[in-house]
Interface confidence: low
């Protein structure tokens, strides 16, 4: 009887995002010990990466990588083509844009090469994995005497994102943020003209094409206004 | 060859309904979310409801709560049921798989789409 562990990995969405199903085993030996878990991020539909924790093995092992589309056109067993290494054991695999179908249920299975038996397959929902480059071209508009306008771009289409846009002054010891949906602009309504503005943005593959939890990075911030630095007495926190 | 189909548009006053259909040769819809798009004259096309092979729905917070998206899995159908309407959907409105056209946005194809005007 195979052994099946239900596992959240932080993507819930209305069934289990994740399975972990182990080979039956005998008697008690190498092959009971566990496979590390295989953590996957697609990176702005372009390419994906599967990586675990080689060092969590008792010994330096290369483990291999195999995945699958369920139920799909795509379901014929692949052999991963592109490992990724640590101190040269195998640490991961990354797939090609090619090779990514985001609604479809995408089957990984890791194995011991060494121990056959010894395998751990897990099912993820690829659309739930999309991690977005981080937003460009941050631009700025004066809208009128106290009105800002924050305008930016990202590499992907509009609509599949939403966006986190931070702000704050020197003088300010946090960030203010707002969140913002596919239309990425942001607007400020009331600026002080005499403080010095920052403006950050991250964006997330939600909700519309998928269920992602996870942020892009920070884009590069942008600044306005008169810089009073001389005069903050907060500015050296901040920059710490 | 791929084909779409749109139909179910019309001229309909402000508050009314329509049910739009669209019909998806195979290897489009199968394994596939899909989704309505809508495209008003001198703007981006953009996504207004997507639906997952499993029944998952999403949708642009304009239209949340007026339209409902669903599909019949063994006819290769995907609807869009649109009520309260307002003159601001006026658009044509395309289906298509979403990952096709995350895939090659540029290059995916289209079908005739089907047009929507919501007008007193």
């Known amino acids: 009887l195979n052994t099946t562990i239900l596992t959240p990995n932080g993507n819930e969405d209305t069934t289990a995002d994740f399975f972990l199903t182990t080979m039956p085993t005998d008697s008690l030996s190498v092959s009971t010990l566990p496979l590390p878990e295989v953590q996957c991020f697609v990176f702005n539909v372009e390419y994906m990466n599967c990586t675990w924790n080689s060092s969590s093995e008792p010994q330096p092992t290369n483990l291999t990588l195999h995945y699958w589309y369920k139920n799909s056109d795509n379901d014929k067993v692949q052999k991963c083509s592109h490992y990724l290494f640590s101190e040269e054991i195998t640490s991961g695999c990354q797939l090609q844009k090619k090779e990514i179908h985001l609604y479809q249920t995408f089957v990984v299975q890791l194995q011991d090469p060494r121990e056959p038996r010894r395998q751990a397959t897990q099912m993820l929902k690829l659309q739930n994995l999309v991690i977005p480059w981080a937003p460009e071209n941050l631009t700025l508009h004066k809208l009128s005497e106290s009105q800002l306008e924050l305008n930016w771009n990202n590499r992907f289409l509009n609509h599949c994102l939403e966006h986190l846009v931070q702000y704050r002054t020197d003088w300010d010891h946090s960030w203010t943020e707002q969140s913002v949906d596919y239309r990425h602009k942001f607007s400020l309504p009331s600026v002080d003209g005499q403080k010095r503005y920052t403006f950050r943005v991250r964006s997330r593959f939600n909700p519309l094409c998928g269920s992602a939890q996870h942020w892009s990075e920070w884009s590069h911030p942008i600044h306005w206004g008169s810089n009073t630095s001389k005069e903050n007495p907060f500015l050296f926190a901040l920059e710490a | 060859q791929v084909q779409l189909q749109e139909s179910g548009g019309g001229l309909v006053q402000p508050g009314g309904s329509l049910r739009l259909s669209c019909a998806a040769s195979g290897s489009i819809f199968s394994g596939n979310a899909m989704g309505w798009y809508r495209q008003a004259p001198g703007k981006q096309r953009e996504l207004v409801a997507s639906?997952?092979?499993?029944?998952?729905?999403h949708y642009v917070d304009s239209v949340k709560g007026r339209f409902t998206i669903s599909r019949d899995n063994a006819k290769n159908m995907v609807y869009l049921q649109m009520s309260s309407l307002k003159p601001e959907d006026t658009a044509v409105y395309y289906c298509?798989?979403?990952?096709?056209?995350?895939?090659?946005?540029?290059?995916?194809?289209w079908g005739p789409g089907t047009q929507v005007t919501v007008s007193s």
């Open positions: 298509n798989a979403q990952e096709r056209v995350y895939s090659d946005y540029a290059f995916a194809s």
């Open positions: 639906i997952t092979s499993g029944g998952d729905t």
